[in-house]
C-alpha cells in the first residue's frame, strides 16, 4: 500500500485570505483504505472525504493555524502524516520616519510594518541598510508592537515598529538608506523594503559641469547590488543629468583612510592607495555583482580594479580596505556614466 500527502511538506505557510487544499490519499491492496483528517490545536477547515482519500481545504484564516494530522488505515497497518499550517499576513505596508535624513546631525529613524501576523521577533526582523548591507553604527532601540484597529472582528493583526539612533552621516552622505523588513516562515522568506532618502547639501562634492548650487535630494535604487559597511562614505550624485566625469580623487576624510582615484581613460579603472606609512596594504573588498569577475592588481599600498574588456561603468558601491586597521573607503558610481575617450 502507498500513503501520500500532497503537498508533501510537513510545514506549510499560507497567506491570509488565500486558500490551500491538502490531499491525503492511500491505496490499499486489501479493500478500500480509510483516510481521514484529524485536527490538533486547530478548528479544521472543510474536509471532503472520498474512498481512499481526504481533502482538507484551508481558507487562509488565522483560525486555520495549527497541525492537522491525516490518518490512513489499510488492513493491519496505519499511517499518519501531520502538516503544520501557519497563516501569515505581510502586506507591503512599510512606513518610515522621517521622510528624509539630514546629514551632519544625530537622528532617530523609525520603520513600521503594518497589518502583520505572526508578530513575533522570531518571525519578523528589521534591518537598516546601506545598499545591501546593514548600516554599521546604527543603534537599534527596543521594538514596539501594537494591535491594529480592525474593521472586522477576530483578525488580530499587528504593527511592529523598529527605531534606530543614527550617528551623524557626515558629508558627503550616502544617497539613501533603506528599511528592510523580513518575515521568515517555513520554507518561505518574504522581504519588503522602503527607501529613506538622504538630503544632500550644496557642500556635497559635485561632478564638474554641474551648475546648480541648490540643495538636492539623492535617491538610490532599492535593489542596489553592493553595499557599504561604514558611515563615512564618498558619493557621486546620481541625480540626472549624468555629466561626463573627469579623472579625480574621491576619498573619505578621516584619520588615514585609503584614497580612491578613478580613471576613465580607455575603459575605466579604480585605484585605491594608502599613504599611512610603511607596512600598509590595501585591497578591494566590495564591488557591484561578484568581485571575482573584476580584474584586480594588488601591490602593497596600491590596488587597481578594472573591468575587462572595457565597457560601461558598473553602477553601485565600491569599497577598498586598508590593513592593518581595517579602515575602509567607499565610492558610489552612477550607472549612466560611460567612458568615451573621443568626446571633447
Amino acid at each position: 500500500q502507498s500513503f501520500q500527502v500532497n503537498p508533501p511538506e510537513s510545514e506549510v505557510a499560507v497567506a491570509m485570505g488565500t486558500s490551500l487544499q491538502i490531499t491525503c490519499s492511500m491505496s490499499c491492496d486489501e479493500g478500500v483504505a480509510r483516510v481521514h483528517w484529524r485536527g490538533l490545536d486547530t478548528s479544521l477547515g472543510s474536509v471532503q472525504t472520498l474512498p481512499g482519500s481526504s481533502i482538507l481545504s484551508v481558507r487562509g484564516m488565522l483560525s486555520d493555524t495549527g497541525t492537522p494530522v491525516c490518518v490512513g488505515s489499510c488492513g493491519s497497518r496505519s499511517f499518519q502524516h501531520s502538516v503544520k499550517i501557519l497563516v501569515y499576513a505581510f502586506p507591503d505596508q512599510l512606513v518610515v520616519s522621517p521622510e528624509f535624513l539630514v546629514p551632519g546631525q544625530d537622528q532617530v529613524v523609525s520603520c513600521t510594518a503594518h497589518n502583520i501576523w505572526p508578530a513575533d521577533p522570531n518571525s519578523l526582523s528589521f534591518a537598516l541598510l546601506l545598499g545591501e548591507q546593514r548600516l554599521e553604527g546604527a543603534q537599534a532601540l527596543e521594538p514596539e508592537q501594537e494591535e491594529e484597529i480592525q474593521e472586522a472582528e477576530g483578525t488580530p493583526l499587528f504593527r511592529m515598529t523598529q527605531r534606530w539612533r543614527l550617528p551623524s552621516l557626515g558629508t558627503p552622505a550616502p544617497p539613501a538608506l533603506h528599511c528592510q523588513v523580513t518575515m521568515q516562515l517555513p520554507k518561505l522568506v518574504l522581504t519588503h523594503r522602503k527607501e529613506i532618502p538622504v538630503l544632500q547639501s550644496q557642500t556635497s562634492p559635485k561632478p564638474p559641469n554641474t551648475t546648480s548650487a541648490e540643495p538636492y535630494i539623492l535617491t538610490s535604487s532599492s535593489t542596489a547590488e553592493a553595499v557599504s559597511t561604514g558611515l563615512n562614505i564618498t558619493t557621486l550624485p546620481s541625480a540626472p543629468p549624468y555629466p561626463k566625469l573627469s579623472p579625480r580623487t574621491l576619498s573619505s576624510e578621516g584619520p588615514c583612510r585609503p584614497k580612491i582615484h578613478q580613471d576613465l581613460e580607455a575603459g575605466w579603472e579604480l585605484l585605491c592607495e594608502a599613504s599611512c606609512g610603511p607596512g600598509v596594504t590595501v585591497r578591494w573588498t566590495l564591488a557591484p555583482g561578484d568581485l571575482a569577475t573584476y580584474h584586480k592588481r594588488e601591490a602593497g599600498a596600491q590596488a587597481w580594479l578594472s573591468v575587462l574588456p572595457p565597457g560601461p561603468m558598473v553602477e553601485g558601491w565600491f569599497q577598498c580596505r586598508q590593513d592593518p586597521g581595517g579602515e575602509v573607503t567607499n565610492l558610489y558610481v552612477p550607472g549612466q556614466v560611460t567612458p568615451n575617450s573621443s568626446s571633447t
Partner: antibody
C-alpha cells in the same frame, strides 16, 4: 498530576494468559491514543500495540498479533492488554503510554511499568 | 516494516561535551521521528517529537533535526544528569519501531 499506573504483571507459565491494566488520571483519557510498549531485560524498547482514542482502531506488532488484544474502557479511564499463549520471549517490563492521535507526536506520558515473567 | 538504525550504540563523553546521536529510517518518514531518554530502572521520557519540537519541560540543550530518512539528536553541553540511554522512534506507520538505543556513558 498526569499519571499512568500499570498492574497485572507476574509470573506465568508458557502458554498461559495474563491481563494487564493501566489506570489513567490527570488528563482527558478519552482524547488520547494509548499504547503498550515492552522492554525485555537488558534490551531496547519494543512497541506492542496501540488503540485509538475512541477504541475503534487497533494495531499490533507482528510478534504479538493474534495472541494479544488491546482494549480500553473510557468510562473507567483504563487501558487493558489481554495476553494469551504467552512465550518466554514475552518476558519484559510492560509500559502503558499515551500519545495524541495514536502516535505521530510521540509517547509523552509513561507509567512506571509492570513486569511479566514467562517461565516454567 | 520501517527499520530504525541508531548510531553509535554507545559513546563515552565528559560533562560539557557536545554529543550527537544519529538515527536512520529505512524509508521516508517525513518528520515523524521522536527521541526518548531512559535511565536504568525508569520509564522512558519523551525529549523531542516531530523531529525537532522540544517536549515541554525538556532543557533547551537538547535539540533534534532532520527530515525524510536522516535524523539527529544533539546535546549541546552534556550535563551529569544526561548520562542515560537514548532511543529514536518512528511514528509514521505501524508497526511503530524504535532504534536500538545509544548508551551515553561517562568518560
Amino acid at each position: 498530576e498526569v499519571q499512568l499506573l500499570e498492574s497485572g504483571g507476574g509470573l506465568v507459565q508458557p502458554g498461559g494468559s495474563l491481563r494487564l491494566s493501566c489506570a489513567a488520571s490527570g488528563f482527558t483519557f478519552s482524547s488520547y491514543g494509548m499504547h503498550w510498549v515492552r522492554q525485555a531485560p537488558g534490551k531496547g524498547l519494543e512497541w506492542v500495540a496501540v488503540i485509538s482514542d475512541d477504541g475503534s482502531d487497533k494495531y499490533y506488532a507482528d510478534s504479538v498479533k493474534g495472541r494479544f488484544t488491546i482494549s480500553r474502557d473510557n468510562s473507567k479511564n483504563t487501558l487493558y492488554l489481554q495476553m494469551n499463549s504467552l512465550r518466554a520471549e514475552d518476558t519484559a517490563v510492560y509500559y502503558c503510554t499515551t500519545s495524541k492521535y495514536y502516535y505521530y507526536y510521540g509517547m509523552d506520558v509513561w507509567g512506571q511499568g509492570t513486569t511479566v515473567t514467562v517461565s516454567s | 516494516d520501517i527499520q530504525m538504525t541508531q548510531s553509535p550504540s554507545s559513546l563515552s563523553a565528559s560533562v560539557g561535551d557536545r554529543v550527537t546521536i544519529t538515527c536512520q529510517a529505512s524509508q521516508d518518514i517525513s518528520k515523524s521521528l521522536n527521541w526518548y531518554q531512559q535511565k536504568p530502572g525508569k520509564a522512558p521520557k519523551l525529549l523531542i517529537y516531530a523531529a525537532s519540537s522540544l517536549q515541554s519541560g525538556v532543557p533547551s540543550r537538547f535539540s533534534g533535526s532532520g527530515s525524510g530518512t536522516d535524523f539527529t539528536l544533539t546535546i549541546s553541553s552534556l550535563q551529569p544528569e544526561d548520562f542515560a540511554t537514548y532511543y529514536c522512534q518512528q511514528g509514521y506507520s505501524t508497526p511503530l519501531t524504535f532504534g536500538g538505543g545509544t548508551k551515553v556513558e561517562i568518560k
